[in-house]
C-alpha cells in the first residue's frame, strides 16, 4: 500500500503567441480545481475507462477575477497535494490523466457551473520511494507544470511497496535471511511466504500463500506474459483481463495543434486551423524575416522582407554564424567554478550552475545559513546547497531545539549504568569493568587492559565521558 502524490506548480498560458483568454472575468469570477486519474501499466487507455489505480480531486483554488485587458497569467492554484492512495502493489509503470476544471462563481441558478479547461495525459515509469519527478504538459494553449512521486505507507517498503517491515525483535540484527529495511535501518523485512513457485520478479503477495501478478503478467504463479497478439481493436490491443489494450485516444486528444491552433478530427487523421502568422500541419511553422531581428551582436540583416524569402546576416568582427551568434571560443579558459558548465552564446558567456551554487561564474555557495538560527548555542555549517546545525553538547535535532538524551544510545558497555550530566554523560561501571564507557575489563590480578588509571580513580568508579 502507498500514496501517489501530485503537486501542481503552475497552470497558465503556454509559450508562443495565441495566448488563451483568461477563463475568469469580472462578471464571472471563477476558481480552479484539478482531478487526477491513475491507471496501471503503459496502455493507451480511453479517458473514460476506470481509474483502476485511483483518482483524486483537489481543493478549490482562490477566487480569481481577470483584470480587464490583461493577458491570462498563471492562475492561482489550490493549496496542497493531490493524493491518490493505492491498496495493492505500486505497478512501476502507469498512465495518468490530469484535468483542470473551472468553477464559475457568478449568479448561476442552481449553484456554481463547472467546465473542463484542459486535460493532459501521459504514460510514465516511476519507482516508489524515489525522488519527485518533474513534468511539463501542454493542452492546446495551456501549459501545466507539476511534480509527482509514489511513496509506500509503513510497513510497506521497496520500489513496488511489496516488501513489509517490522520493528526489530533483537537490538542488533535481523532474523535469519531477513535484511534491514532501508531507509528504516532499525526495522527488519518481515517474513512473508507467498505461494510456492510464485515468480519473485512478476508476482507478490500481501497475505501468506497467495500469488498476485504485477501488470503485464498472468497465470497462477505470474510466469505467463500477457499476450497482445490476439487483439482485434482497430486502435490496438484491448483490456487488461484479456491481455489487450482498450481503444486509444482520438487524433485530437491532447490537441496536437501548436501555437493556439484548434483541432478537428477528419476521417483519416486531424486538421489544424492555425492562427494568423502560423502554418503547417500542426501550426508549427512561423516565417522569420528581418523584421524579427534574427541577427545577433549588431549583425546587419539583408533581404528576407517576407516569410518566403531568406535573410542574410552580415556579422561584425569577432562574430560568426548565419545569425552572428557565435563568438570566438572563450570557454576554454574554464571560467565556471564548482562544476558549472560553460556556454558560449555568441553574444555572451554563461555558466550554468549546479544546484547550491550561483553567480556569474557559479562562485557563490548559496548561503544556506542566512536567516537560519541554530538554537541553544549551535552553529550553522553550510555547504553544497544544504545547511545543518552543529549542536552544543546536550542538544540535537535539525535546529538544535531538541534536548538530547545522552543516555538514549545506551553508551555504557557491560551492564554499566548511564547518568545524564550537565556536560555529557557518566557511566557507572559494573564490577570488573572500567573506562569512559566501561569498555575495558579489569584483569583478575588487578591489572587492567588500560594504561594505568588516572590517580584517585578506582575500577568501578563512575567515569565521566567527556
Amino acid at each position: 500500500a502507498g500514496v501517489f502524490e501530485l503537486q501542481i506548480h503552475s497552470f497558465g498560458p503556454g509559450p508562443g503567441p495565441g495566448a488563451p483568454r483568461s477563463p475568469c472575468s469580472a462578471r464571472l469570477p471563477c476558481r480552479l480545481f484539478f482531478r487526477v486519474c491513475l491507471k496501471p501499466g503503459l496502455s493507451e487507455e480511453a479517458a473514460e475507462s476506470p481509474c483502476a489505480l485511483g483518482a483524486a480531486l483537489s481543493a478549490r483554488g482562490p477566487v480569481y477575477t481577470e483584470q480587464p485587458g490583461a493577458p491570462a497569467p498563471d492562475l492561482p492554484l489550490p493549496d496542497g497535494l493531490l493524493q491518490v492512495p493505492f491498496r495493492d502493489a505500486w505497478p512501476g509503470t502507469f498512465s495518468f490523466i490530469i484535468e483542470t476544471w473551472r468553477e464559475e462563481l457568478g449568479d448561476q441558478i442552481g449553484g456554481p457551473a463547472w467546465s473542463l479547461l484542459a486535460r493532459v495525459a501521459g504514460r510514465r515509469r516511476l519507482a516508489a520511494g524515489g525522488p519527485w519527478a518533474r513534468d511539463i504538459q501542454r493542452a492546446g494553449a495551456w501549459e501545466l507544470r507539476f511534480s509527482y512521486r509514489a511513496r509506500c505507507e509503513p510497513p510497506a517498503v521497496g520500489t513496488a511497496c511489496t516488501r513489509l517491515c517490522r520493528p526489530r525483535s533483537a537490538p542488533s540484527r535481523c532474523g535469519p535471511g531477513l535484511r534491514p529495511c532501508a531507509p528504516l535501518e532499525d526495522e527488519c523485512e518481515a517474513p512473508l511466504v507467498c505461494r510456492a513457485g510464485c515468480s519473485p520478479e512478476h508476482g507478490f503477495c500481501e497475505q501468506p500463500g497467495e500469488c498476485r501478478c504485477l501488470e503485464g503478467w498472468t497465470g497462477p504463479l505470474c510466469t505467463v506474459p500477457v499476450s497482445t497478439s490476439s487483439c482485434l481493436s482497430p486502435r490496438g490491443p484491448s483490456s487488461a483481463t484479456t491481455g489487450c489494450l482498450v481503444p486509444g485516444p482520438g487524433p485530437c486528444d491532447g490537441n496536437p495543434c501548436a501555437n493556439g491552433g484548434s483541432c478537428s478530427e477528419t476521417p483519416r487523421s486531424f486538421e489544424c486551423t492555425c492562427p494568423r502568422g502560423f502554418y503547417g500541419l500542426r501550426c508549427e511553422v512561423s516565417g522569420v524575416t528581418c523584421a524579427d531581428g534574427p541577427c545577433f551582436n549588431g549583425g546587419l540583416c539583408v533581404g528576407g522582407a517576407d516569410p518566403d524569402s531568406a535573410y542574410i546576416c552580415h556579422c561584425p568582427p569577432g562574430f560568426q554564424g548565419s545569425n552572428c551568434e557565435k563568438r570566438v571560443d572563450r570557454c576554454s579558459l574554464q571560467p565556471c567554478r564548482n562544476g558549472g558548465l560553460c556556454l558560449d552564446l555568441g553574444h555572451a558567456l554563461r555558466c550554468r550552475c549546479r544546484a547550491g551554487f550561483a553567480g556569474p561564474r557559479c562562485e557563490h555557495d548559496l548561503d544556506d545559513c542566512a536567516g537560519r538560527a541554530c538554537a541553544n548555542g549551535g552553529t550553522c555549517v553550510e555547504g553544497g546547497g544544504a545547511h545543518r546545525c552543529s549542536c552544543a553538547l546536550g542538544f540535537g535535532g535539525r535546529d538544535c531545539r531538541e534536548r538530547a538524551d545522552p543516555c538514549a544510545a545506551r553508551p555504557c558497555a557491560h551492564g554499566g549504568r548511564c547518568y545524564a550530566h550537565f556536560s555529557g554523560l557518566v557511566c557507572a561501571c559494573a564490577p570488573g569493568y572500567m573506562g569512559a564507557r566501561c569498555e575495558f575489563p579489569v584483569h583478575p590480578d588487578g591489572a587492567s587492559a588500560l594504561p594505568a588509571a588516572p590517580p584517585g580513580l578506582r575500577p568501578g568508579d563512575p567515569q565521566r565521558y567527556l
Epitope: 509559450p15 511539463i136 545569425n323 570557454c331 574554464q334 558548465l341 560553460c342 556556454l343 558560449d344 549546479r354
Partner: antibody, heavy 124, light 111 residues
C-alpha cells in the same frame, strides 16, 4: 580521431541489472571540457537522455529524474571509459542505448561523438 | 515522452527547401541553445547544428536554423536524396534539469 566503443549484453531478464560500458579513444574521460552521456532510443519514447558524468576539478554526475533511483553512471580513469548501470529493468527499458560525448568547448549540450549503439532487449 | 514538439513528417522534391519546426517552452528553448541531429536509418544520430546555428565541420551550409522565443526551426535548402533521414531538435531544460529531445521529423525526398 575520437571514437566511442560500446560493449554490454543485448538481452537482459526483467528485474535484473543492465550494465553497459563505453570505451573512449582519442580523448580522455577526465577531460576538463567534455561531458560523457548515456542516451537511449525506443519507438515508444523516442530519444531519451539518461545520465552524464564529467570532470571539472572533481567528478560530477547528473541523472534524468524519472530514472534517478534506478541508474548509476561511473567514470573509470584507469581504463578511460565510463559505464551505465540500470537496476530492476522491465520490458519498457528495451531500447537502443548510446553513449555520447558533449565535447564542443562552449557547447556542452551538443553531442558531437556517438557510440555505435547497443540494442538491449528486456525479456525473460 | 518528448518535451519538444516536432511535426512527424516533412517532404520536398530535390532542389526544394524544407523547414522543420521545434516547439518548446521557456525553460528549454526559451533559455538555452538548440541543437539539431540527423539520424540515417540504422545509424546513431549525428550532430548537425549546435548552439543556435553553429555547424560542425563537414556539415554543408544548406542546413541552417533559427530560434524565436520558445520555438526553433531547421531549414534545409537545395534538398538532396541523402538528406532523407530523421531529424531531432534538443536543448537543456532548466526546469527538468536534464536534456530534452524533440519527437523527431522524418524528411522524405520525393522523386
Amino acid at each position: 580521431q575520437v571514437q566511442l566503443q560500446q560493449s554490454g549484453p543485448g538481452l537482459v531478464k526483467p528485474s535484473q541489472t543492465l550494465s553497459l560500458t563505453c570505451a573512449i579513444s582519442g580523448d580522455s574521460v577526465s577531460s576538463n571540457s567534455a561531458t560523457w552521456n548515456w542516451i537511449r532510443q525506443s519507438p515508444s519514447t523516442g530519444l531519451e537522455w539518461l545520465a552524464r558524468t564529467y570532470y571539472r576539478s572533481k567528478w560530477y554526475n547528473d541523472y534524468e529524474v524519472s530514472v534517478k533511483s534506478q541508474i548509476t553512471i561511473n567514470p573509470d580513469t584507469s581504463k578511460n571509459q565510463f559505464s551505465l548501470q540500470l537496476n530492476s529493468v522491465t520490458p519498457e527499458d528495451t531500447a537502443v542505448y548510446y553513449c555520447a560525448r558533449g565535447g564542443i568547448v562552449g557547447a556542452p549540450d551538443a553531442f558531437d561523438i556517438w557510440g555505435q549503439g547497443t540494442m538491449v532487449t528486456v525479456s525473460s | 515522452q518528448s518535451v519538444l514538439t516536432q511535426p512527424p513528417s516533412a517532404s520536398g522534391t530535390p532542389g526544394q527547401g524544407v523547414t522543420i519546426s521545434c516547439s518548446g517552452s521557456s525553460s528549454n528553448i526559451g533559455s538555452n541553445p538548440v541543437n539539431w541531429y540527423q539520424q540515417l536509418p540504422g545509424t546513431a544520430p549525428k550532430l548537425l547544428i549546435y548552439s543556435n546555428n553553429q555547424r560542425p565541420s563537414g556539415v554543408p551550409d544548406r542546413f541552417s536554423d533559427s530560434k524565436s522565443g520558445t520555438s526553433a526551426s531547421l531549414a534545409i535548402s537545395g534538398l538532396q536524396s541523402e538528406d532523407e533521414a530523421d531529424y531531432y531538435c534538443s536543448a537543456w531544460d532548466d526546469w527538468l534539469n536534464g536534456y530534452v529531445f524533440g519527437t523527431g521529423t522524418k524528411v522524405t525526398v520525393l522523386t
